[in-house]
């Protein structure tokens, strides 16, 4: 039986050109996390696998950084980054848990959750 729940940062907004931390947390289960996928609509951003570490999708590799924890930091935001993001936790023996985050990228200075990652 799947007892776990996914907690996410929910609906968040950030400033164009800024950065944002996408975070999900799996709680209320002792299931082992074997992999976490981060997706934007139907597009894969990143995977963190228990045995293979992180893989960042080539189309995002220059502006996505792993962390904090199993979260993801998205840099150099554009209005095209507005939309739904999903964290998909693959666990054993429970199965798959999915969390949803809605990001709105704003033209004005209303950034939240600014990250401290820097991509040289």
């Amino acid at each position: 039986m799947m007892t776990g729940t996914i907690e996410t940062t929910g609906n968040i907004s950030a400033e164009k050109g800024g950065s944002i931390i996408l975070q999900c947390h799996l709680s209320s289960t002792t299931a082992q996390v074997t992999q976490v996928n981060w997706e934007q609509q139907d597009q894969l951003l990143a995977i963190c696998n228990a045995d293979l570490g992180w893989h960042i999708s080539p189309s995002f590799k220059d502006r996505v950084a792993p962390g904090p924890g199993l979260g993801l930091t998205l840099q150099s935001l554009t209005v095209n980054d507005t939309g739904e993001y999903f964290c998909i936790y693959h666990t054993y023996p429970d199965g798959t848990y999915t969390g949803r985050i809605f990001l709105e990228v704003l033209e004005s200075s209303v950034a939240e959750h600014g990250a401290r990652f820097q991509i040289p």
């Epitope: 975070q23 228990a50 570490g53 992180w54 960042i56 904090p68 840099q75 990250a115 401290r116 991509i119």
Partner: antibody
């Protein structure tokens, strides 16, 4: 097997800089974050910052911004941390540690830095 | 930043005795991680995601907790368990460690 090799010790003068290395082997260097942790008897373990060698992205503990600079060389699978303007407060053991899905699952043996004239 | 407070700072236990140490967070964290450090060695990951044993860790170790309160338990103390144990949060920057619990053998 995963290994993180660090030099044993560095003796440096006050005001100078030091660049310490952490050579990784036994895994894909560009697929894991590499963190640096300071250990002193008084302050315990402190996270300095981390780097993702896949794209060079860095994150710093605000306390160590301006003090530490993290870099990584993909060709040699080596992470580096440079500490600048050293004082006696910087005398400590510095560890590198990799992280993936399981937090900091492998640690180097640590580099002992002594700042003394 | 999230402050982790470990207690007790120092404790001793006899072989075969049950040992429990705690880690309290200043604000809620999703998971806790525990590391063991023996004198002269680097820290070693002991428990990840609050309750899962890292590779090669004896089953006498266990972790539990949620929110702001976490604990590490050794069901039957052995001489080789004498070490300092640190908790760590990995949920938000900056990552922080507890001050450590030094466990000695009686």
């Amino acid at each position: 097997q995963v290994q993180l090799q660090q030099p044993g010790a560095e003796l440096v003068k006050p005001g100078a800089s030091v660049k310490m290395s952490c050579k990784a082997s036994g895994y894909t260097f560009t697929s894991y974050n590499m963190h640096w942790v300071k250990q002193t008897p008084g302050q315990g373990l402190e996270w300095i910052g981390g780097i993702y060698p896949g794209n060079g992205a860095t994150s710093y503990n605000q306390k160590f911004k301006g003090k530490a600079t993290l870099t990584a060389d993909k060709s040699s699978s080596t992470a580096y941390m440079q500490l600048s303007s050293l004082t006696s407060e910087d005398s400590a053991v510095y560890y590198c540690a990799r992280s993936g899905l399981r937090a900091m699952d492998y640690w180097g043996q640590g580099t002992s830095v002594t700042v003394s004239s | 930043q999230i402050v982790l407070t470990q207690s007790p700072a120092i404790m001793s236990a006899s072989p075969g005795e049950k040992v429990t140490m705690t880690c309290s967070a200043s604000s809620s964290v999703s998971y806790m991680y525990w590391y063991q450090q023996k004198t002269g060695s680097s820290p070693r990951l002991l428990i990840y995601d609050t309750s899962n044993l890292a590779s090669g860790v004896p089953v006498r170790f266990s972790g539990s907790g949620s929110g702001t309160s976490y604990s590490l338990t050794i069901s039957r103390m052995e001489a080789e368990d004498a070490a300092t144990y640190y908790c760590q949060q990995w949920s938000s920057y900056p990552y922080t460690f507890g001050g450590g619990t030094k466990l000695e053998i009686k």
